[in-house]
Amino acid sequence: MAVTACQGLGFVVSLIGIAGIIAATCMDQWSTQDLYNNPVTAVFNYQGLWRSCVRESSGFTECRGYFTLLGLPAMLQAVRALMIVGIVLGAIGLLVSIFALKCIRIGSMEDSAKANMTLTSGIMFIVSGLCAIAGVSVFANMLVTNFWMSTANMYTGMGGMVQTVQTRYTFGAALFVGWVAGGLTLIGGVMMCIACRGLAPEETNYKAVSYHASGHSVAYKPGGFKASTGFGSNTKNKKIYDGGARTEDEVQSYPSKHDYV
């Protein structure tokens, strides 16, 4: 029961985290105009990964996309890449984890297969979260570095336009969304990995033991699994495991990584 709860909670936390990573990536407020020196402006600037915007005191908002690829700073490109990789891995992880959920029955899938999928999705969530945290941190570092520069415009030359701007930029809401979302995805991934270890406890408490008879082999595994002889192909007992179809004999003859605690 605890394993199911851990797995379910891990899935939900990761889902929220990945939704947050997607939201952060799409948000325009990665950097916002620093208002320290001049707190009252009729025009407020903010910038995202894909476009920069102004919000006027009248409520009018105008955005301008970064219509160049080569003209953008390498660091910005790197941040974009990290966030996209994080989203892609997270999305795949979510897809895998749905099928891995203990509360969902799909055909005659073994718990060992679900454990494997849970571990895979957990690792994907961890990497996804790390990508998001890394991306946001790189951008934050870029902002800090640029903050003290005289022009303090981190996109100098963006779009092929030279800018003589005194505007300084500070952390935008998207950075905090990204950090929190990355952290949640990471935590969700860890929970999935923990849940993986607890799946099918009967299988995973002991190493599989094989008893070999002279005439034929009888593989025995504790936990109520029926013994099956080595005679015949035993094709009617094939199960999906570890990405491929194997007989029960094959499964029991080669202990998987889940057979050790």
């Epitope: 105009q33 001049n38 009252v40 402006t41 009729a42 025009v43 407020f44 600037n45 903010y46 910038q47 920069s52 915007c53 102004v54 006027e56 005191s57 009248s58 409520g59 009018f60 105008e62 955005c63 301008r64 415009n153 996109y155 779009g159 336009m161 800018q163 003589t164 701007v165 005194q166 505007t167």
Partner: antibody, heavy 121, light 113 residues
Framework: QVQLVQSGAEVKKPGASVKVSCKAS????????ITWVRQAPGQGLEWMGE????????FYNEKFKGRVTMTTDTSTSTAYMELRSLRSDDTAVYYC??????????????WGQGTLVTVSS | DIVMTQSPDSLAVSLGERATINCRSS????????????LTWYQQKPGQPPKLLIY???TRESGVPDRFSGSGSGTDFTLTISSLQAEDVAVYYC?????????FGGGTKVEIK
């Protein structure tokens, strides 16, 4: 066509208050801000503040803060500017102008004809 | 407050000649968010309210003759009347539309020589 029609000239004594009106027509009143600018005789233009009828948000020039109040009546599409504690150096022509709004950037494209306020004892 | 400095104070130009008015702001009026300069030019004739000529430093208001053009970025801006006409005699003001309080230049009086 867009029109901003201001109230007539006023003569006030020092310490008194004046309330200038600006009636807008020819456009959706709530879609644009109203800015107030004054011009002392033979002098340049001085921005006093602006109000956005849709939200009621106001931005005042610190120089006039505490003495000026800008309001709007959306039912009559009229903007008001009240200046209190008048001094002789408040003698000027007061203009209202249509500013930016949620659908358009900020610049003053239409102006009222101006209201001359004379402060004299 | 942002100081807008216009030069010259007055300008006498022959009909059909070019008139150039300069405006300098104490801080950059360039907005990186939309790549626009929040500087506006107005024309004021005696006894009349100001008239919008150019906004965003270089965008001509509809109905304004194409002999009027604006240029510049950041802190330095120019209004050019390519071929002065008699009806262009007026005082021209530049205005900071970026920082509160919004401020106007002192004005440049354009006359016919």
């Amino acid at each position: 066509q867009v029109q901003l029609v201001q109230s007539g000239a006023e003569v006030k004594k020092p310490g008194a208050s004046v309330k200038v009106s600006c009636k807008a027509s020819g456009y959706t009143f709530t879609n644009f801000g109203i800015t107030w600018v004054r011009q002392a005789p033979g002098q340049g233009l001085e921005w006093m503040g602006e109000i956005y009828p849709s939200s009621g948000n106001t931005f005042y020039n610190e120089k006039f803060k505490g003495r000026v109040t800008m309001t709007t009546d959306t039912s009559t599409s009229t903007a008001y500017m009240e200046l209190r504690s008048l001094r002789s150096d408040d003698t000027a022509v007061y203009y209202c102008a249509r500013g930016g709004g949620p659908l358009r950037s900020r610049y003053f494209d239409y102006w009222g004809q101006g209201t001359l306020v004379t402060v004299s004892s | 407050d942002i100081v807008m400095t216009q030069s010259p104070d007055s300008l006498a130009v022959s009909l059909g000649e070019r008139a150039t008015i300069n405006c300098r702001s104490s801080q950059s009026l360039f907005s990186s968010g939309n790549q626009k300069n929040y500087l506006t030019w107005y024309q004021q004739k005696p006894g009349q309210p100001p008239k919008l000529l150019i906004y965003w430093a270089s965008t001509r208001e509809s109905g304004v003759p194409d002999r009027f053009s604006g240029s510049g970025s950041g802190t330095d801006f120019t209004l050019t009347i390519s071929s002065l006409q008699a009806e262009d005699v007026a005082v021209y003001y530049c205005q900071n539309d970026y920082y509160y309080p919004l401020t106007f230049g002192g004005g440049t009086k354009v006359e016919i020589k």
